[in-house]
Amino acid sequence: ESALITQQDLAPQQRAAPQQKRSSPSEGLCPPGHHISEDGRDCISCKYGQDYSTHWNDLLFCLRCTRCDSGEVELSPCTTTRNTVCQCEEGTFREEDSPEMCRKCRTGCPRGMVKVGDCTPWSDIECVHKESGTKHSGEVPAVEETVTSSPGTPASPCSLSG
């Protein structure tokens, strides 16, 4: 595999079961969906829904399939050649700097800002300053900070959820 492998990625100990398909390696490597035998003579298929390999490899085992966490939806299941694809549920997003969990999207923008981008599974709502158009990357505003127009008028669009 081209990616760095950590021990958490690995499938539980397994020996080649009789039902696992075998083929011969090509130039010492096995195709995606397989791992190599100890003696390097056979390619052993990964187990569908349990483990996978995405690249030509000479690894002794396939990588363990990811299980989607609560708060995530499964976009596509794990196959022998591709890991599970999980996505944050609606109203939540996953940041690059904290990929281990889905965080709730903000429900509105801070005072003096307008919403220019909706909540998506991979990004929070995007707010910019009304005047300058500068992006805001601050923390979730306090409820009273959420932008509303002057008293008695309807809330501006940036106070609605995305």
Partner: nanobody, 123 residues
Framework: EVQLLESGGGLVQPGGSLRLSCAAS????????MSWFRQAPGKGLEFVSA????????YYADSVKGRFTISRDNSKNTLYLQMNSLRAEDTAVYYC????????????????WGQGTLVTVSS
Amino acid sequence: EVQLLESGGGLVQPGGSLRLSCAASGLTFPNYGMSWFRQAPGKGLEFVSAIYWSGGTVYYADSVKGRFTISRDNSKNTLYLQMNSLRAEDTAVYYCAVTIRGAATQTWKYDYWGQGTLVTVSS
């Protein structure tokens, strides 16, 4: 974190025997190979022997076949190398290494290495 600690090296006369050990910790891979490599003074790393943890597949370099025996104790997570009929040319630092690749007799296939233990064969 994977750690490998070799022991058992020392000075021995030609024709004598030594048993090297390599205690491994932090290994939770479903299968892996453990090997002995050696480096003689002024020379490069040379593959000596390998054994796989799950199926027990074993490899030896031609230069040690019939004289050296590799074995493992799964319960202690320890690798051994029984060296008999030692010769002056067996003098080297012996390293224990771990791989997660099949048919691994090349150094580049090994991800984890011990610090080494010195074996000197001399009269």
